[in-house]
């Protein structure tokens, strides 16, 4: 996160860290807890690393440096990458993770509400992006979970800024014209959440952007509302019933 500040305990209890354990262990992506046994993240986090057993998912944490060999983590039972995601195209950058064991909810570990299907009418004015990613383009993973308040921009405006890319209706963009605040490397898969009528909703999944926090180069996020049918289908067919946090 560029231009952000330290988060507090329990401020973003749905935020998880997706880490890979090969010879060493490292944070690779973020993710959002959306049910007792489900995490929503970006499909590209698994490019070249689709093996379930190398992943460790840490929830209910604030500081990555607090993680030790004794820190509990979740393992992956199943990775469900969107069927239309292709490494060669970059659209449909969304994936579900089914955890091997359900998580208990606590003050520091609980799910984020999902938006309504095809939510296009809601005007979100209070949106935040969180993660342990770089604090500048040539940066490093941050120890303390960072947060930054970023306004959404229209897809039309976003398309103007990314003329070589196709900004689809299944994407949402966020950023300041002058830059300075944005997601960055290591924030992928994490949440773009917006508070509306007193409730936080998962509006986007951190996906891509040219550089980080550059002037007139907003961050691009997978628009969760456009994938509600897919999320419900996959979680229900796997669970028998959905255990998602959908708004009332």
């Amino acid at each position: 996160i560029v231009g952000g500040t330290n988060s507090s305990w329990g401020e973003w209890p749905w935020q998880v860290s997706l880490q890979v354990k090969l010879t060493a262990q490292r944070h690779l992506c973020g993710g959002s807890l959306i049910g007792h046994q489900w995490v929503l993240t970006a499909a590209h986090c698994f490019d070249g690393l689709p093996l379930q057993d190398v992943w460790r998912i840490y929830s209910g944490i604030l500081n990555l440096s607090d993680i030790t060999k004794d820190t509990p983590f979740s393992q992956i039972k199943e990775i469900i990458i969107h069927q239309n995601y292709k490494v060669s195209e970059g659209n449909h950058d969304i994936a579900l993770i089914k955890l091997q064991a359900p998580l208990n909810y606590t003050e520091f570990q609980k799910p984020i509400c999902l938006p309504s299907k095809g939510d296009t009418s809601t005007i979100y004015t209070n949106c935040w992006v969180t993660g342990w990613g770089f604090s500048k383009e040539k940066g490093e993973i941050q120890n303390i979970l960072q947060k930054v308040n970023i306004p959404l921009v229209t897809n039309e405006e976003c398309q103007k800024r990314y003329q070589d890319y196709k900004i689809t209706q299944r994407m949402v963009c966020a950023g300041y014209k002058e830059g300075g605040k944005d997601a960055c490397k290591g924030d992928s898969g994490g949440p773009l959440v917006c508070k509306h009528n007193g409730m936080w909703r998962l509006v986007g999944i951190t996906s891509w952007g040219e550089g980080c926090a550059r002037r007139e180069q907003p961050g691009v996020y997978t628009k969760v509302a456009e994938y509600m049918d897919w999320i419900l289908e996959k979680t229900q067919s796997s669970d028998g019933k959905a255990q998602m946090q959908s708004p009332a």
Partner: antibody, heavy 124, light 106 residues
């Protein structure tokens, strides 16, 4: 399969021009920084030039600045290197290499995919 | 410009040996240091990125360490397929490669 394939190398006289191409496949070409790296006979690797995903930002090694131009056509998944005013010291194998991407995962920095290279010989 | 000095320029070793190659930057580059293996007629192969992160698919006998200006590539037990030239590269400010280290059979 993720692949880069260079072409366009050959023998050219000093002062001449050559255009190298690199065809990419198996990944979202438009999401990645792309680079040209060369290796002269008996020497180490030398970075030549890089270009941002959209093509809006380019960088060059001092040794080629003003003579070489990097460009890309994202619709064709192709990277180019236009080489003008060639000198004997430009003789090398030229590699196309993929750099960091626009994706925001913590998988960054290195040139992780390379082509097999194309030989450029500058000689009279 | 950032200069990268690699040492030694060549070394002879036997299968099973522990091999260490060093790379020094002319100024601090944080962890923006990568290591490559290069064999004649082949494409260079990324081994380590970010000073210590093993590239996916690379054997665990390869490891990297360092921060700032001094970096090390270690091969814990040299295998026949490891005889090659190794290059370091900084990506902190544009890109610079070290001169290379040729690992030969003793």
């Amino acid at each position: 399969e993720v692949q880069l394939l260079e072409s366009g190398g050959g023998l050219v006289q000093p002062g001449g021009s050559l255009r190298l191409s690199c065809a990419a496949s198996g990944f979202t070409f438009s999401f990645y920084n792309m680079n040209w790296v060369r290796q002269a006979p008996g020497k180490g690797l030398e970075w030549v030039s890089s270009i941002s995903p959209s093509g809006g930002e380019t960088n060059y090694a001092d040794s080629v600045k003003g003579r070489f131009t990097i460009s890309r056509d994202n619709s064709k998944n192709t990277l180019y290197l236009q080489m003008n005013s060639l000198r004997a010291e430009d003789t090398a194998v030229y590699y196309c290499a993929r750099g960091g991407g626009a994706y925001r995962n913590n998988w960054w920095g290195g040139f992780d995919i390379w082509g097999l290279g194309t030989m450029v010989t500058v000689s009279s | 410009d950032i200069q990268m000095t690699q040492s030694p320029s060549s070394l002879s070793a036997s299968v099973g040996d522990r091999v260490t190659i060093t790379c020094r930057a002319s100024q601090s580059i944080s962890v923006y240091l990568n290591w490559y293996q290069h064999k004649p007629g082949k494409a260079p192969k990324l081994l380590i990125y970010g000073a210590s992160n093993l590239q996916f698919g690379v054997p665990s006998r390869f490891s990297g360490s360092g921060y700032g200006t001094d970096f090390t590539l270690t091969i814990s037990s040299l295998q026949p397929e490891d005889f090659a030239t190794y290059h370091c590269q900084q990506t902190f400010s544009l890109f610079t490669f070290g001169g290379g280290t040729k690992v030969e059979i003793k």
